[in-house]
Amino acid sequence: FERTRSLQDPCSNCPAGTFCDNNRNQICSPCPPNSFSSAGGQRTCDICRQCKGVFRTRKECSSTSNAECDCTPGFHCLGAGCSMCEQDCKQGQELTKKGCKDCCFGTFNDQKRGICRPWTNCSLDGKSVLVNGTKERDVVCGPSPADLSPGASSVTPPAPAREPGHSPQ
């Protein structure tokens, strides 16, 4: 290891995983347990992130890099670097202040996280509903009614009594 790279600042020679120890003539001391430095020339080491409680360790802290956390089963990460864990809900639900609630009629959520979103309005694109929406699934839009003239397609149009997007609850 080259210790003479910088005559001006001996600390610039200290690599990641060390800190420049002023108490010991600016030698490159190891980052002590549960701390790290990810860049060279550091005068202190950073304390490792603790993945506790609802967080679990995805990657342990090393001398040169911080720990990385994810969430325990039943929770998912939010924020940069998984700074928060949010409770999972079932598909067809969204998380509210009062806990997991079913999606309102006309909305769906096909994931365990996030909010319920409105079903696609097929008619805006001049299409018809091929498969009805549910709490867990969006509607499937099919060809426009005009494309469904007799003999033009083998697709059976939806029952006329149903409104677009309706789903039996």
């Epitope: 290891f1 200290c14 060390t18 190891p30 002590p32 347990p33 890099s65």
Partner: antibody, heavy 117, light 112 residues
Framework: QVQLQQSGAELMKPGASVKISCKAT????????LEWIKQRPGHGLEWIGE????????NYNEKFKGKATFTANTSSNTAYMQLSSLTSEDSAVYYC??????????WGQGTLVTVSA | DVLMTQTPLSLPVSLGDQASISCRSS???????????LEWYLQKPGQSPKLLIY???NRFSGVPDRFSGSGSGTDFTLKISRVEAEDLGVYYC?????????FGGGTKLEIK
């Protein structure tokens, strides 16, 4: 899981040198300090020094400067400690250990070095 | 160098008893970063030492909760609430706050 596998026992003549190896598996070898410890019956445990394999930077207990030299090969995930100018005082079990939540979170099984004419 | 003095040298106990080992450092062992790197290790016959306690009072993973560490400054204690046969061996305290890092002389826990 973290494992440190050390080389086998050595019987050496006074004045000779010996090189002990410590092969690491189960973690990113280059990113953790490796420590070396000496144990002699009746003398307890002594810290020799340490090496950070990724950069090759090392620190030594003043008592072992000139006696021990640390190297590491990151392609084989193996650290080495060479002991020079052996005397009977160097007869001991030598351990490598990896830093973690503590200075010696994980230990090798030890290498017995015997110096005898 | 920081001298680590362990007492007693030998500790005869009956299984199920509480055991207490003292470790005193010749100077304060707070690191420059504010942490106290006082650790306890157990070495069973024919084995490598194993980490029990780190930073004075934290149990390492897999260490039974009958082991506890306490202390500050220069006085530290390891307690075993109910000694079991597998706890027998030599216990070492260690300070990693100052260079050179140093071990205590060891305390042998044995059956009375």
């Amino acid at each position: 899981q973290v494992q440190l596998q050390q080389s086998g026992a050595e019987l050496m003549k006074p004045g000779a040198s010996v090189k002990i190896s410590c092969k690491a598996t189960g973690y990113t070898f280059s990113s953790y300090w490796l420590e070396w410890i000496k144990q002699r019956p009746g003398h307890g445990l002594e810290w020799i020094g340490e090496i950070l394999p990724g950069s090759g930077v090392s620190n030594y207990n003043e008592k072992f400067k000139g006696k021990a030299t640390f190297t590491a090969n990151t392609s084989s995930n193996t650290a080495y400690m060479q002991l020079s100018s052996l005397t009977s005082e160097d007869s001991a079990v030598y351990y490598c250990a990896r830093l973690g939540l503590a200075w010696f979170a994980y230990w090798g099984q030890g290498t017995l070095v015997t110096v005898s004419a | 160098d920081v001298l680590m003095t362990q007492t007693p040298l030998s500790l005869p106990v009956s299984l199920g008893d509480q055991a207490s080992i003292s470790c005193r450092s010749s100077q304060n062992i707070v690191h420059g970063n504010g942490n106290t790197y006082l650790e306890w290790y157990l070495q069973k016959p024919g084995q490598s030492p194993k980490l029990l306690i780190y930073q004075v009072s934290n149990r390492f993973s897999g260490v039974p909760d009958r082991f506890s560490g306490s202390g500050s400054g220069t006085d530290f204690t390891l307690k075993i609430s109910r000694v079991e046969a597998e706890d027998l061996g030599v216990y070492y305290c260690f300070q990693g706050s100052h260079v050179p890092r140093t071990f205590g002389g060891g305390t042998k826990l044995e059956i009375k």
